[in-house]
């Protein structure tokens, strides 16, 4: 499939101009290669009318130009003084016309309306409101006022001052007669339909002295805004329908066959199953505007989207709408990463999150998608040293491996951790990705004691048993804190006896704390990694108490206390609503507020990512 994208249809009127934008992946080769606009010939081929290398056909001389915008991967063709001869099938493309790096565009130039003299033209968007003003003279002030629509050769009454309303306009039309000072009456039509377009005649009086005024109503279907996003990336649809529908239910739908528009999400709580875990509808502003964020873009997400307002929460005739044509570029700059990561209860997952490598200094985040109402994504961790209180000791965001990827590790998994998580940064909003964590049957691979108590001034040895499957991995112990997990020295104690059917390659690696102090209290992780890529981890909480009896403590698996369940939500809890997710520039303000609240919270971490493969939780 060609990665070039543009408008499928362009409609205009004789004498007018059009501006056609075509999108291409902004690789260095594409940025510098020839751009062209060609017309498809009746006998094959596509004949260049204008190109970026200076060619302008005689047909276009003096009325067209082509401008390349390499920095954002677009080029624009402007054509002026359109005639009906310009109607036809075109392509915009890159390179050589016959090579297929192009997009088909249909240009339709229609004749301008043949209007009667003194005709007032009203041009209004579909679903909006029009007010047709009708002046009259004093002698007709007390006479019947009416509005007719020309249907073929005959005028058909639409509304009049005696109370008649044509059934096609019921519930959406009114006739207002201004105060005595103004010789004017108005007809207001709401929820305009395409079928309302046409020639109207308003009239005051019914005899030969009546006052008449012609009006031409043009109802415009909104031209879709072109949106070009990368596979696996993110898109935001900003929908501003105006304050008059501020209190009406809003929706985003995707056009399927014909005129059908399947609801993707609406403010009445409906959400299409295909978008579970990867969509947020941001709360409306007072003016009725709202936005919808979709992450983890798939090929099948491409198409025409409409946002609108209607009490049913779905598209109906007369809904005010905005339109987008979404193209999903399969030559994506966003790398593949797992869309599903599996872990076992008590075990861990390590999730890789991609980010735009040009933004290595950006703040990284990880949030948990919640589907209630319109969806939201409260933050769990960031790269600035903040971790949500109940995730202390079991969640860490690491800048490794770097160069476009960061890692999030979550351990002590429970069934409540199953769900969708988003990776994001305060930089490029297109690089939001989604991953689903699934909790499956099984036992954790790493075996550690539960809670451990150390004695002040003594030595503590904590074991971690690694099965033979991790023989080629680097094994480590580290102390968790809000900025990550600081590596500690550990000892290889030889083969472990903790595994059945496991040979000499299993390992027991111990952490030794000499002369324990109060500062040693906290969470410790043992884990495996290969270079900068992290695998499974297991966590142990070490408590420190006063000396009771002399000697060192060597903790075994059998003596371990039960691990504590999740901590309850405390006052340090922080959540950034979807508004911040939708516009990460808001993070800075939210963070400043949060920092003052969360100083007791002392924890730091990060965000998660997605693609088309699945990844197990135990290793990479």
């Amino acid at each position: 499939k060609s990665p070039i994208f543009g408008p499928e249809e362009v409609n205009s009127v004789e004498g007018n101009s059009v501006s056609i934008t075509c999108y291409y992946p902004p690789t260095s080769v594409n940025r510098h290669t020839r751009k062209y606009w060609c017309r498809q010939g009746a006998r094959g081929g596509c004949i260049t009318l204008i190109s970026s290398e200076g060619y302008v056909s005689s047909k276009y001389a003096g009325r067209a130009n082509l401008t390349n915008f390499p920095e954002n991967g677009t080029f624009v063709v402007n054509i002026a003084q359109l005639s009906q001869d310009d109607s036809g099938r075109y392509k915009c493309g890159l390179g050589i016309n016959s090579r297929g790096l192009s997009f088909d565009v249909s240009l339709e130039v229609s004749q301008g309306p043949g209007l009667l003299n003194d005709t007032k033209v009203y041009t209004v968007d579909l679903g909006r409101t029009v007010t047709i003003n009708c002046p009259f003279k004093t002698e007709n002030a007390q006479k019947r006022k009416s509005l007719y629509k020309q249907i073929g050769l005959y005028p058909v009454l639409v509304i009049d001052s005696s109370g008649y309303v044509n059934p096609n306009y019921t519930g959406r039309i009114r006739l207002d007669i201004q105060g005595t000072g103004q010789l004017l009456f108005s007809v207001v039509i709401n929820q305009l339909r395409l079928s309302d377009a046409g020639q109207y005649l308003c009239q005051a009086g019914d005899d030969s002295n009546s006052n008449k005024k012609n009006a031409d109503l043009q109802v415009l279907k909104p031209e879709p805004e072109l949106v070009y996003e990368d596979l696996r990336g993110s898109v935001t649809f900003h929908c501003a329908l105006g304050p008059e529908v501020a209190n009406v239910a809003k929706f985003l739908c995707r056009q399927s066959s014909g005129e059908n528009c399947d609801v993707v999400v609406n403010t009445l709580g409906k959400r299409a199953p295909a978008f579970e875990g990867r969509i947020l509808l941001n709360p409306q502003d007072k003016d009725g505007s709202f936005s919808v964020v979709i992450t983890g873009l798939r090929k099948e997400d491409a198409g025409r989207y409409l946002c609108g307002a209607h009490s049913d929460g779905q598209l109906q005739e007369g809904s005010p709408i905005q339109a987008w044509q979404l193209f999903v570029n399969e030559e994506s700059t966003i790398p593949r990463s797992p869309t599903v990561v599996k872990g076992v209860a008590g075990g861990s997952v390590a999730v890789l999150c991609p980010y735009n490598r040009k933004e290595s200094k950006s703040i990284k985040y990880w949030c948990l998608w919640e589907g209630a109402q319109n969806g939201r994504c409260p933050l769990l961790v960031d790269s600035e040293g903040w971790v949500k209180a109940q995730y202390e000791g079991r969640l860490s965001l690491l800048e490794e491996p770097g160069n476009g990827t960061f890692t999030v590790i979550l351990n002590q998994l429970t069934s409540r951790d199953a769900g969708f998580y988003w990776c994001l940064t305060n930089g490029d909003t297109l690089w939001r990705t989604t991953v689903e964590i699934k909790i499956i049957e099984g036992e954790p691979n790493l075996k550690v004691p539960g809670n451990v108590t150390a004695v002040l001034g003594e030595t503590l040895k904590v074991p971690c048993h690694f099965p033979c499957k991790f023989s080629s991995y680097e094994k480590y112990w580290c102390k968790w804190n809000n900025t990550g997990c600081q590596a500690l020295p550990s000892q290889d104690e030889g083969p472990s006896k903790a595994f059945v059917n496991c040979d000499e390659n299993s390992r027991l690696v111990s952490l030794t704390l000499n002369l324990v102090t109060r500062a040693d209290e906290g969470w410790y992780w043992c884990g495996v990694k290969q270079g900068h890529f992290y695998g499974e981890t297991a966590a142990v909480y070490v408590a420190v108490e006063e000396r009771k009896a002399a000697g060192s403590r060597d903790v075994s698996l059998a003596k371990a206390d039960a691990a504590p369940d999740e901590k309850v939500l405390d006052s340090g809890f922080r959540e950034i609503e979807n508004k911040a997710i939708q516009d990460p520039r808001l993070f800075a303000e939210e963070k400043a507020v949060a920092d003052t609240r969360d100083q007791a919270d002392g924890s730091r971490a990060s965000v998660d990512s997605g693609s088309s493969e699945e990844q197990g939780g135990s290793s990479r």
Epitope: R34, Y36, C38, R39, G41, A42, R43, G44, G45, I47, T48, L49, S51, E53, Y55, S57, S58, K59, I96, N97
Partner: nanobody, 129 residues
Framework: EVQLVESGGGLVQPGGSLRLSCAAS????????IGWFRQAPGKEREGVSC????????YYADSVKGRFTISRDNAKNTVYLQMNSLKPEDTAVYYC??????????????????????WGQGTQVTVSS
């Protein structure tokens, strides 16, 4: 093998005439629009003339209008460029090339060189006293 061969070039004095021929082998020219191009030393290749296969219409660059005439003889599978009143600035290598059957008409002139598929090897025309 599909081939275009130009001939008829040479040295001529200003005001003189030459007739260039473009003979096709391996395919018939009557389906294609044919263009003549030229390239002077150190300059870009430029379109000179184009003849349409669909309606026989002909198109010329402003610099040669009224002096050059393009014609075709489908029976001989050849296209000609008659060049009169030659000027020193007409000195160049002249090439003929084929394009889609309605290209000249679509652009109402000489199509972009990128739209031409098969090209001849060129014939040198030198106008000098």
């Amino acid at each position: 093998e599909v081939q275009l061969v130009e001939s008829g070039g040479g040295l001529v004095q200003p005001g003189g005439s030459l007739r260039l021929s473009c003979a096709a082998s391996g395919f018939t020219l009557d389906y294609y629009d044919i263009g003549w191009f030229r390239q002077a030393p150190g300059k870009e290749r430029e379109g000179v003339s184009c003849t349409s296969s669909s309606d026989g219409s002909t198109y010329y660059a402003d610099s040669v209008k009224g002096r050059f005439t393009i014609s075709r003889d489908n029976a001989k599978n050849t296209v000609y460029l008659q060049m009169n009143s030659l000027k020193p600035e007409d000195t160049a290598v002249y090439y003929c090339a084929t394009t889609f059957g309605d290209a000249c008409t679509v652009v109402a002139g000489i199509p972009d060189q990128y739209d031409f598929g098969s090209w001849g090897q060129g014939t040198q025309v030198t106008v000098s006293s």
